[in-house]
Interface confidence: low
């Protein structure tokens, strides 16, 4: 239904608090370098304007689109060109080209310092003095570092942040209460960021049809008792919502997400028996709960999938009549029977099925040709199952840090041209898959591992796209989204790579390493490891183990020394010499 004033409509639907939060996220994701104070000023102006439109929808400019209103605000910022360079050129364009232009200038790796959490006491003081400003800073800092973060979900994390601070700031040992709880929120939010980036990549590169296929598979796994038509409706809505958020239409996205949650709660009988607990919650928590909902129980009497899709004599007729609907029903039927498969695997199977029908339905005896299609799925299923088995075994043997190092060596050998910080970030994230997934029950491991790896590899692709350096990475990243993970897994040592010359300064360390937090210490060591592999791509596992063990001992010894600086200065060159020798 059309509204005279789009901005008034969204303000009324969302309420002032959520409206302001979403406008702040939108501005922070578009102009990532602007300070909080500048953005909050714009947010207040937009909010005041929205209120005038609520009071009178016919007031001047109230009929303008939200993109027009937001874009005009951004383009009115003084010194826009000085701070943002060619992004200022977007302002010469008209909508919708102007918004498209802003989207193209979003930076996935902005040159911003890592978000430092203040010390507990200071945090509680500023939170208690002005909770709204404190949480506004949180939204701003996360949104500018993650320009595709799913806005309604970020509001949910801000709410969680608020809950933790409210609870912990009254405790005597604030740090002991805050640290684990905020770490948990941060971990969840970081995973949410890479997952959403993957969704936006899917939408940007492959369009709505590909995203909708992903949504059909996911929904069918979660709601195996829902009819195909119901799943189609949910997938259509989820596709629209994600398209809006990925496209910067954050107010519409959040509003539609709340509408979908309402619809699901009003139609539990036809969707899932597991929704009730979510439906009793307030709006942000309700949507988040529904997004994370456990799978419903699979109906007991499901017939074999072969009946409709292999044995039925009408397969080719049904396929020819309505290809998308027929393939959609196949994806639905297969997915609802397999909550133990990853969405990527289910989409690969659907693609294989489609290719088989395309080939066989053009032949003389189609049923004989496609009759073996389900058996041909076997190797496609075995490949990720083996990946999970070998990687989880390795994780159990080495622990998270050791497993990250193994992954780092593997990926540096596959793509040594990629910058060391990017390789270290990717390997650390890929390595976390062990902790995240390998401890889960068997039936949940494969979907957890493969869908998480796909999201992390998408981040690698997004960063690599900015400055392409490896042909192999470009090849894996340009192909289909669901084939990326198998493509990366299949990469071997890059034989074309000319090893980096050994630079002593790369392996020279100082006493400042001793005071670093554990995480930063690990990153320093992993940076050195990647550089070693770039110097000797064919170094054996034993050689690398020797050098890294020697390095760890050196750091440990010098950090315990009375004169740390002297120890690093004298022992460092010896370590470098020993390492060169070990790798010769």
């Amino acid at each position: 239904e059309a509204h005279k004033s789009e901005i008034a409509h969204r303000f009324k639907d969302l309420g002032e608090q959520h409206f302001k939060g979403l406008v702040l996220i939108a501005f922070s994701q578009y102009l990532q370098k602007c300070p909080y104070e500048e953005h909050i000023k714009l947010v207040q102006e937009v909010t005041d304007f929205a209120k005038t439109c609520v009071a009178d929808e016919n007031a001047e400019n109230c009929d303008k689109s939200i993109h027009t209103l937001f874009g005009d605000k951004l383009c009115a910022i003084p010194k826009l060109r000085d701070n943002y360079g060619e992004l200022a050129d977007c302002c010469a364009k008209q909508e919708p080209e102007r918004n498209e232009c802003f989207l193209q200038h979003k930076d996935d790796n902005p040159n911003l310092p890592p978000f430092q959490r203040p010390e507990a006491e200071a945090m509680c003081t500023s939170f208690q003095e002005n909770p709204t400003s404190f949480l506004g800073h949180y939204l701003h800092e996360v949104a500018r570092r993650h320009p595709y973060f799913y806005a309604p979900e970020l509001l949910y994390y801000a709410e969680k942040y608020n809950e933790v601070l409210t609870q912990c700031c009254t405790e005597s040992d604030k740090a002991a209460c805050l640290t684990p709880k905020l770490d948990a929120v941060k971990e969840k939010a970081l995973v949410a960021a890479v997952r959403q980036r993957m969704k936006c990549s899917s939408m940007q590169r492959f369009g709505e049809r590909a995203f909708k296929a992903w949504a059909v598979a996911r929904m069918s796994q979660r709601f195996p008792n829902a009819e195909f038509a119901e799943i189609t409706k949910l997938a259509t809505d989820v596709t629209k919502i994600n398209k809006e958020c990925c496209h910067g239409d954050l107010l519409e996205c959040a509003d539609d997400r709340a509408e979908l949650a309402k619809y699901m709660c009003e139609n539990q009988a036809t969707i899932s028996s597991k929704l009730q607990a979510c439906c009793d919650k307030p709006v942000l928590q309700k949507s988040q709960c529904l997004a994370e909902i456990e799978h419903d129980n699979i109906p007991a009497d499901l017939p074999s999938i072969a009946a409709d899709f292999v044995e039925d004599k009408e397969v080719c007729k049904n396929y020819a009549e309505a290809k998308d609907v027929f393939l959609g029903t196949f994806l639905y039927e297969y997915s609802r029977r397999h909550p133990d498969y990853s969405v990527s695997l289910l989409l690969r199977l659907a693609k294989k099925y489609e290719a088989t029908l395309e080939k066989c339905c053009a032949e003389g005896d189609p049923p004989a040709c496609y009759g073996t299609v389900l058996a041909e799925f076997q190797p496609l299923v075995e490949e990720p199952k083996n990946l999970v088995k070998t990687n989880c075994e390795l994780y159990e043997k080495l622990g998270e840090y050791g497993f990250q190092n193994a992954v780092l060596v593997r990926y540096t050998q596959k793509a040594p041209q990629v910058s060391t910080p990017t390789l270290v970030e990717a390997a650390r994230n890929l390595g976390r898959v062990g902790t995240k997934c390998c401890t889960l029950p068997e039936a949940q491991r494969l979907p957890c591992v493969e869908d998480y790896l796909s999201a992390i590899l998408n981040r690698l692709c997004v960063l690599h796209e900015k400055t392409p350096v490896s042909e192999k990475v470009t090849k894996c990243c340009s192909g289909s989204l669901v084939e990326r993970r198998p493509c990366f897994s299949a990469l071997t040592v890059d034989e074309t790579y000319v090893p980096k010359e050994f630079k002593a300064e790369t392996f020279t360390f100082h006493s400042d390493i001793c005071t670093l937090p554990d995480k930063e210490k690990q990153i320093k060591k992993q940076t050195a490891l990647a550089e070693l592999v770039k110097h000797k791509p064919k170094a054996t596992e034993d050689q690398l183990k020797t050098v890294m063990g020697d390095f760890a001992q050196f750091v440990d010894k010098c950090c315990k020394a009375a004169d740390k600086d002297n120890c690093f200065a004298t022992e460092g060159p010896n370590l470098v010499a020993r390492s060169k020798e070990a790798l010769a």
């Epitope: 009819e227 195909f228 038509a229 119901e230 189609t232 409706k233 259509t236 619809y263 139609n267 009988a269 036809t270 609907v325």
Partner: nanobody, 126 residues
């Protein structure tokens, strides 16, 4: 508020055909999930066929698949059920039901349809 009015029922011989119509008012039919249900004497009301609102996907009960076709004419705001190869067991009162929404889809659960017509009787007998 949606008003539904069925027509087209009657007596037909086994193997014959009939076309039922359901005229809707008060709401555009393309924004609404609509379905045909039937109730034979002494039996429960059962789902026959449905078509989505906004998502043009049709859904059929196994017992009528290949014989019955559901369709709608948005310009006339009317739903149809074309019934071919009729059998004696198809004898029942046929009801048209609507489930508005944006876009709502078909469901086999009768309770989820708030709007119903008064029904039209179909008798298949020689």
């Amino acid at each position: 508020e949606v008003q539904l009015l069925e027509s087209g029922g009657g007596l037909v011989q086994p193997g014959g055909s009939l076309r039922l119509s359901c005229a809707a008012s008060g709401r555009y039919i393309d924004e609404t999930a609509v379905a045909w249900f039937r109730q034979a004497p002494g039996k429960e009301r059962e789902f026959v066929a449905g078509i989505g609102g906004g998502v043009d996907i049709t859904y059929y009960a196994d017992s009528v698949k290949g014989r019955f076709t559901i369709s709608r004419d948005n310009s006339k705001n009317t739903l149809y059920l074309q019934m071919n190869s009729l059998r004696p067991e198809d004898t029942a009162v046929y009801y048209c039901a609507a489930r508005p929404g944006k876009p709502l889809i078909t469901s086999k659960v009768a309770d989820l349809y708030p709007y119903w017509g008064q029904g039209t009787l179909v008798t298949v007998s020689s």
